[in-house]
Amino acid sequence: YSHWPSCCPSKGQDTSEELLRWSTVPVPPLEPARPNRHPESCRASEDGPLNSRAISPWRYELDRDLNRLPQDLYHARCLCPHCVSLQTGSHMDPRGNSELLYHNQTVFYRRPCHGEKGTHKGYCLERRLYRVSLACVCVRPRVMG
Amino acid sequence: YSHWPSCCPSKGQDTSEELLRWSTVPVPPLEPARPNRHPESCRASEDGPLNSRAISPWRYELDRDLNRLPQDLYHARCLCPHCVSLQTGSHMDPRGNSELLYHNQTVFYRRPCHGEKGTHKGYCLERRLYRVSLACVCVRPRVMG
């Protein structure tokens, strides 16, 4: 069980909403995926994990913040602008785009709590939405009607 | 703004749920859904959200648990066993498999806390990993060595 340190105010502590505020403002959007400089990595393997066998392969990039729960998040980064041919596993097929799938994940930030006279009273948890890229997906390009 | 839900009530503090209620918005993926003529069909659309334009299309299924945070999680469910042809958007290509991408997401369960003499002292949050399927990915089948 996780008993969060002083995320609930103690007796007599000011429980104003200022103290335990939270925000649902998404963190600024991540940079669009760029194809990897090394063209040899833009291929679909016949073994290994899902992200390397995908015809829209991707790698993971660590995003660590010790004041956030979870502390470690991983962002997908597409290795190819287009999908890789199912036949060869290496040549790109311009009829398909490799696009990032995004998700707004609930995370919690540890923030100092302040008591009656502005004294530090442990830590509060601030809930936020954090934009992560989960994977790269091979899609048909949009046809604008 | 919101008060954190009674994860560590202190001595003498009123831990009634009225006091400790808080609001949130379910966190689905970013792109709004568009109508899909055949919502459960195995085809790759040329418009609409990523999950219907993918050549490994999927739908989302709600998983709701009122004692968990987030309360609403969405599991991807693949609509095709194989990938859809980039050319036609409808015929399946047996050279590619549509596979679920899984992720162990950090969630929090609300559990009763117990005080000094086993008395109920509000709620604690228990941190756990919960397996969710994020998307369906078009992959080359594994070649066993």
Epitope: - | P5, E17, L20, R21, W22, S23, T24, V25, P26, P28, P29, E31, P32, A33, N36, P39, P49, N51, R59, Y60, E61, L62, R64, L66, L69, Q71, D72, Y74, R110
Partner: antibody, heavy 121, light 107 residues
Framework: EVQLVESGAEVKKPGASVKVSCKAS????????MNWVRQAPGQRLEWMGL????????SYNQNFKGRVTLTVDTSASTAYLELNSLRSEDTGVYYC???????????????WGQGTLVTVS | DIQMTQSPSSLSASVGDRVTITCSAS??????LNWYQQKPGKVPKLLIY???SLHSGVPSRFSGSGSGTDFTLTISSLQPEDVATYYC?????????FGQGTKLEIK
Amino acid sequence: EVQLVESGAEVKKPGASVKVSCKASGYSFSGYTMNWVRQAPGQRLEWMGLINPYNGGTSYNQNFKGRVTLTVDTSASTAYLELNSLRSEDTGVYYCAREDFDSWTYFAMDYWGQGTLVTVS
Amino acid sequence: DIQMTQSPSSLSASVGDRVTITCSASQGISNYLNWYQQKPGKVPKLLIYYTSSLHSGVPSRFSGSGSGTDFTLTISSLQPEDVATYYCQQYSKLPYTFGQGTKLEIK
């Protein structure tokens, strides 16, 4: 003002399909889950399923054995209920209902459409 | 699925009376219970959510109580406009389920 306006009454033959629409206005359509509830003559309310307009995520009542499909058109702020393989016992009023919520406490259908009468005979 | 059972199925009371309707769940649902009012020929309306919280615009003569498996809807002083069928609904687990309804009439 929040409003849910449903399509008109339908008369169908057994084995046919029906598609009922529910146009929402007065709030952010993508921000609230939409429920569908049926009321057969003289019967209790029966929950059919829900859909999150934001991602098309659904949950269905298995009592309908896969005959129900829920969809949305966010650009038109409209939710749809499709019921296949109709039988006489599907006769009733079909309601769409917006779901409000507050974590740890409630999920409640706070606004309802006027209902669509579907007659199967 | 969780079964919801209301009692009585119908009742008749006089204006000014205190009226009580009960709702029982087949398993514990904490406080995850709503009450709806459906007037004759009308659409259901949310009355009470989360066992005891009054929805906006609902008169204070309505109140709800209970926890676990047994719940009560009370009208402290019955008014003519309260003639309706009342439904309880659990949302502890999907699928949502409703009680069979209690039809309230004026004597």
